[in-house]
């Protein structure tokens, strides 16, 4: 049952190994003078740590009770530098009456399985077999820090060795590095740096723009309070321990400023009374945008030059300007703010609204039945439309016929040069209600007040017209 037997017989010391009286064997190159380390528990939380002695219930042929089984004492504490190799051992002498004995290695309460360099060697004698379990790690890393133990199962008893503390030492390792910040000019702020060994302690020096800030080191963790900056600076920290120095990343501390003005203000859509714009935000000045202001000036030389201001959120970078005059020219600029203040206004752009619909209805609408009784004659006066309504393109006539509970609305379109129209009688013995609206490219204006005329049955004629008075006429 010997897996490897490079040396003759245990318990004499193995060549090339260090044996500390009756402790476990240890092969440890280059370990002198190394300092302390981070170590973890050899037990699992909530799990009792089994003692390392098992009292066999079996007696030998001569019926004498066997001595308690126990691992020999271990070396205790191995200290070495990162990237070195280490080998350590557990040893136990087991009476030959025990057959199947297996030794497992555990680190910090977890069994070490898989690709670990563990070798168990058996050295049989007349009455006992000396078992040496060796564990080797090549190029140790910090993660190899911990408490290592051997466990042996024998006759349903578990025998546990004393722990071997492996302490891997190296350059300081950062657990918290300074972070980039955006700060207000001349306002104090803190930076934090934390590094660990082993070996401890770790001392921290702060560096600003390549120059050391503190003459005396501070123990890790260190908080640097900077009373305030007037310009951008780069900070880093140096962590020192007995093994040497590690430098953190350099972090830029920016000074918050007002934003740059927005650029590329664009028109996306214009209607008679609104304009949809977008813009590209400028540099935020190391402080998030809070909101933006859209400024609108009417370009008409006759206007009073007043500026309309519309406040909006900083995102999305788009705004629909409303309540504008139709067929007007505007100059539009955008400014945005952060916690420091407002940016300058973007370059101004020109934009125009489209024609609007007429705002007034045709005047003096009159309606009467012509002599042939086949037509209704409608007359009106052209409304006094404003320039912004655009060019008149025509009129829309609504006539509603009502008779015996039945109602029917018809619409007619006539050209802009007309101020009269004739419509065919649709129903006799009925009321016809007429309304007229002016039409431009901007849309349909308001309808005039309704004018009603009664269309009698055949054979009865009434030439009296119906009309709406012109404004100002009694």
């Amino acid at each position: 049952r010997e897996e490897a037997k490079p040396y003759p017989l245990f318990p004499g010391p193995l060549p090339g190994s260090l044996q500390t009286d009756h402790t476990s064997l240890l092969s440890l190159p280059h370990t002198s003078g190394y300092q302390p380390a981070l170590m973890f528990s050899p037990t699992q939380p909530g799990r009792p740590y089994t003692g390392n002695v098992a009292i066999p219930r079996v007696t030998s042929a001569g019926s004498k009770l066997l001595p308690p089984l126990a691992f020999k004492h271990t070396v205790g504490h191995i200290i070495l530098s990162e990237h070195k190799d280490v080998k350590f051992n557990c040893s136990i002498s087991v009476p030959n009456i025990y057959q199947d004995t297996t030794i497992s290695w555990w680190k910090d309460g977890k069994e070490l399985l898989g690709a670990h360099h563990a070798i168990t060697q058996f050295y049989p004698d007349d009455e006992v077999t000396a078992i040496i379990a060796s564990f080797s790690i090549t190029s140790v890393q910090r993660s190899d820090n911990g408490s290592y133990i051997c466990k042996m199962k024998i006759n349903n008893e578990e025998i546990v060795s004393d722990p071997i503390y492996i302490e891997v030492q190296g350059l300081p390792h950062f657990t918290k590095q300074p972070e980039s910040m955006n700060v207000t000019r001349n306002t104090a702020f803190n930076l934090t740096c934390q590094a660990v060994g082993p070996p401890e302690p770790v001392n921290i020096f702060w560096v600003q723009n390549s120059s050391r800030v503190n003459e005396q080191p501070e123990k890790s963790p260190s908080v640097l309070t900077v009373p305030g900056l007037t310009e951008m600076a780069v900070f880093s920290c140096e962590a020192h321990n007995d093994k040497g120095l590690t430098v953190s990343k350099g972090v830029q501390i920016n000074i918050k400023a007002i934003p740059s003005p927005p650029t590329e203000v664009s028109i996306h859509n214009s209607t008679a009374h609104s304009i949809l714009i977008s813009w590209v935000p400028g540099f935020d000045g190391y402080s998030p945008f809070r909101n933006c202001s859209v400024q609108v000036k009417e370009v008409d030389p006759l206007s009073n030059g007043s500026v309309m201001i519309f406040n909006t959120s900083a995102s999305p970078h788009m705004y629909q300007i409303k309540q504008l005059q139709a067929l007007a020219n505007y100059s539009i600029g955008v400014s945005c703010m952060n916690e420091i203040g407002w940016s300058a206004v973007s370059p101004w752009i020109l934009a125009s609204t489209t024609e609007g619909a007429p705002s007034v209805a045709p005047l003096n609408v009159t309606v009467f039945l012509n002599e042939s009784r086949d037509n209704v004659d409608i007359r009106w006066m052209k409304p006094l439309t404003k320039r912004q309504a655009g060019e008149l393109v025509g009129y829309r006539i609504s006539h509603v016929w009502q008779s015996a509970g039945i109602s029917k609305e018809l619409l007619e379109e006539v050209g802009q040069n007309n101020s009269r129209a004739q419509i065919s009688v649709q129903v006799h013995n009925a009321t016809c209600t007429v309304r007229i609206a002016a039409v431009t490219k901007g849309g349909v204006g308001p309808f005039s007040d309704p004018v009603k005329i009664f269309i009698p049955a055949h054979g009865w004629v009434d030439h009296a017209p119906s009309s709406t008075p012109a404004p100002g006429n009694a």
Epitope: S32, P36, G76, G109, E167
Partner: antibody, heavy 116, light 110 residues
């Protein structure tokens, strides 16, 4: 990295007392902590240890007389039923690792006086 | 628990001289031994751990040796500031054997 004890005071025999150790600059989930006491004019006496995962170990003489527990930043030592022999300065100390009971950082100590 | 026996209880030496303090464990503790220095009214300070490894910031005038059950602390080129009480402590398998201290050795510097 530092540790500091608090809660030491004058108590009468039999009155339970808890002494607290507050740590800063390191994590109790990585390092174990020990309690050591020193009677006036006497040597250091190991009481017990709590490792990084919360397992507690006591000197054989201290079992049943003391209870060690911890939170994320504090470690408590409870003297369950003090006697006059428990009059001492109580030190808490940071272990070298999770389960290592050598102590590389010590608190200044807190005085517990047990008297009628 | 392991019992630690420290000798002598007190030692006197002149400035520039050498002092040797011994510590014996009641059973093998490998190299899991630490040495501490304590001055009157102060907290203890770690000097050496793993029997021979100097703690950070400790002068090389302090040296530890030994393994198993016999350990030695040697202070050479003695200075007035070295006047203190020195303690050994085992931390071998602390979960099983405790973390006992030796009784202490008072060093008097003349």
């Amino acid at each position: 990295q530092s540790v500091e004890e608090s809660g030491g005071r004058l108590v009468t025999p039999g009155t339970p007392l808890t002494v607290t150790c507050t740590v800063s600059g390191f994590s109790l989930s990585v390092y174990g902590m020990g309690w050591v006491r020193q009677a006036p004019g006497k040597g250091l006496e190991y009481i017990g240890f709590i490792n990084n995962v919360g397992n507690t170990y006591y000197a054989s003489w201290a079992k049943g007389r003391f209870t060690i527990s911890k939170t994320s930043t504090t470690v408590d030592l409870k003297i369950t039923s003090p006697t006059t022999e428990d009059t001492a300065t109580y030190f808490c100390a940071k272990g070298g690792g999770g389960d290592w009971g050598y102590f590389n950082i010590w608190g200044p100590g807190t005085l517990v006086t047990v008297s009628l | 628990d392991v019992v630690m026996t420290q000798t002598p209880a007190s030692v006197e030496a002149a400035v520039g001289g050498t002092v040797t303090i011994k510590c014996q464990a009641s059973q093998s503790i490998g190299n899991a031994l630490a040495w501490y220095q304590q001055k009157p009214g102060q907290r203890p300070k770690l000097l050496i751990y793993a029997a021979s490894n100097l703690a950070s910031g400790v002068p090389s005038r302090f040296a530890g040796s030994g393994s198993g059950t016999q350990f030695t602390l040697t202070i050479s080129d003695l200075e007035c500031a070295d006047a203190a009480t020195y303690y050994c402590q085992t931390y071998y398998a602390i979960n099983r054997y405790g973390g006992a201290f030796g009784g202490g050795t008072e060093v008097v510097v003349k």
